[in-house]
Amino acid sequence: LPKAPVITTPLETVDALVEEVATFMCAVESYPQPEISWTRNKILIKLFDTRYSIRENGQLLTILSVEDSDDGIYCCTANNGVGGAVESCGALQVKMKPKITRPPINVKIIEGLKAVLPCTTMGNPKPSVSWIKGDSPLRENSRIAVLESGSLRIHNVQKEDAGQYRCVAKNSLGTAYSKVVKLEVEVFARILRAPESHNVTFGSFVTLHCTATGIPVPTITWIENGNAVSSGSIQESVKDRVIDSRLQLFITKPGLYTCIATNKHGEKFSTAKAAATISIAEWSKPQKDNKGYCAQYRGEVCNAVLAKDALVFLNTSYADPEEAQELLVHTAWNELKVVSPVCRPAAEALLCNHIFQECSPGVVPTPIPICREYCLAVKELFCAKEWLVMEEKTHRGLYRSEMHLLSVPECSKLPSMHWDPTACARLPHLDYNKENLKTFPPMTSSKPSVDIPNLPSSSSSSFSVSPTYSMT
């Protein structure tokens, strides 16, 4: 008698390893013999697909070599025209030993930056990833973390992070190890001990001592007044990534000696500089403070403006303060080529004394800003017209670079000599007699925003502030 199909062995979940065989059995009782079709994720499996073998009148489906992409829901459907079609479904779970698909690579990184060592894995169950540094498991902390992807992220890389690393991927089926990679931490050249300035008698022997560190170990060169040291003996030693250089000098003239530590990072170099002065008798000694240091002005642009042998402040927020500050002045001076002969010398004096601020001794030598009164004299008397143009250009964003903005002081942010005559520097170039000022052309604006102070006569050493000038 005809009999509708009944699936006597329902499909079950099958676990299979990659590259192994997986078989689903769909035993059917019926009369006449049914037609059995198979689907994966509701898509019909074609009889001629060579990745599959369908036997026993369609009751056995074999995946000949399981791939990672084969997982899904497999269903068999039996139909013999008697009654309705019947269906049974089961899942194929592809199990996979851990496999590292993107292993870590050797990394060179500069101290303080972020390092990421990749370790992307495959596997089912999903492998857990851990890392080994040297021979020990790597502990995570606030800086070091294993990301969800398995990659190792190290924030603010430190010297002690250098070493050999490998990642380990583990699941219930096995463990995979990456090859060992090297994390090399490079450190910018840094001066540990700067040479000290000396005030000595003529003919003395002085040893300047400079110690630097970095990875790779830096080289040290000595510069005397801007040129390679021509005399004196240099002794060097290297121990534990620290280079120690001693320059012995026979002193017959004062000089500025700079120790330059240099090391290479790929195609780039990092340098650190420290300077000391050798002075004879009353020559001044520049000392370092935490924002920069004092040194004799050795540039060209401000030669005519700054006093001979002026000690100026070099700002160490620039990698090369002398060069950077000189470039600032140079850029600003180019803008001055078009200003009036009345404005130009005053503006040049202002720029040079603002960018290369006079050094003032004290607890530590520090830069001394220009007095507000002199700044205002330039802004509202000597260069009133030009200043208005510059402010307009700045407002409209017409300058090619913004470097000149650093060159022009904001007068209101400068100290007044009225409250502390030692808080700021005068501009000797503006110490004209009041008689001379009467010959200056009238201002463009009807009245300056503040009254211009009386500038001292050249014979006077003190600065008399006009009674009306009381801007605080």
């Epitope: 002075s279 001044s284 000694k285 006079e358 003032s360 004290g362 100290p415 409250w419």
Partner: antibody
């Protein structure tokens, strides 16, 4: 006219702490170096500390580690925190405006350290 | 630290007399770059706060009478009161500002 008004002085036991304040007016406080100077009874002047326009502080060796100078440019106020006070810290404490010279002085606030 | 030594420790003068007070520093207080002497003079009248008289060794602070003048260089400095007045009775201090500030021990001026 520059005015510097100190406050916060008083009697304190050895090992104790005190916080001195100096309210400044009549000038743009943030643009100037500010100092603390003290004068023990019947004695001379002793400079203690200076704070520059970037709030970088410097101290005399005698108070380094015990005293802390600070400034609040919004409130136009200079502070001196005195910790671990000793009897020899008994003095009149002056707030002073000035960089190379001590140009303007307050009237002072008396600190007495005694058990 | 630079040590400042003042002399004499006290002086008595009559009104109209000239008075000189000396101050010696243990090392030079002249800054080579600008050749300024970082030496200041102060007056402290009884019961009052000190006031600045002279800075940079010889520059008179504004509002200070012309009878007060300063001179000297390197390590030796002098404060001169050309014609002493009754209101000049005070203690006078020198102070160096070349490094961490230090004061002299003071000179007491009494008027006869």
């Amino acid at each position: 006219e520059v005015q510097l008004v100190e406050s916060g002085g008083g009697l304190v036991q050895p090992g104790g702490s005190l916080s001195l304040s100096c309210v400044a007016s009549g000038f743009t406080f943030s643009l100037y170096y500010m100092n603390w100077v003290r004068q023990a009874p019947g004695k001379g002047l002793e400079w203690l500390s200076v704070i520059d326009t970037h709030s970088i502080a410097y101290y005399a060796d005698s108070v380094k580690g015990r005293f802390t100078i600070s400034r609040d440019n919004v409130k136009n106020t200079l502070y001196l925190q005195l910790n671990n006070l000793k009897p020899e810290d008994t003095a009149l404490y002056y707030c002073v405006l000035g960089r190379t010279a001590l140009v303007r002085w307050g009237q002072g606030t008396q600190v007495t350290v005694s058990s | 630290d630079i040590v400042m030594t003042q002399s004499p420790s006290s002086v008595t003068a009559s009104v109209g007399e000239k008075v000189t007070i000396n101050c010696k520093s243990s090392q030079s207080v002249v800054f080579g770059s600008n050749q300024k002497s970082y030496l200041n003079w102060y007056q402290q009248r009884p019961g009052q706060s000190p006031r600045l008289l002279i800075y940079y060794a010889s520059t008179q602070e504004s509002g200070i009478p012309d009878r007060f003048s300063g001179s000297g260089s390197t390590t030796d400095f002098t404060l001169t009161i050309s014609s002493v007045q009754p209101e000049d009775a005070a203690v006078y201090y020198c102070q160096q500002a070349y490094s961490a500030p230090t004061f002299g021990s003071g000179t007491r001026l009494e008027i006869k």
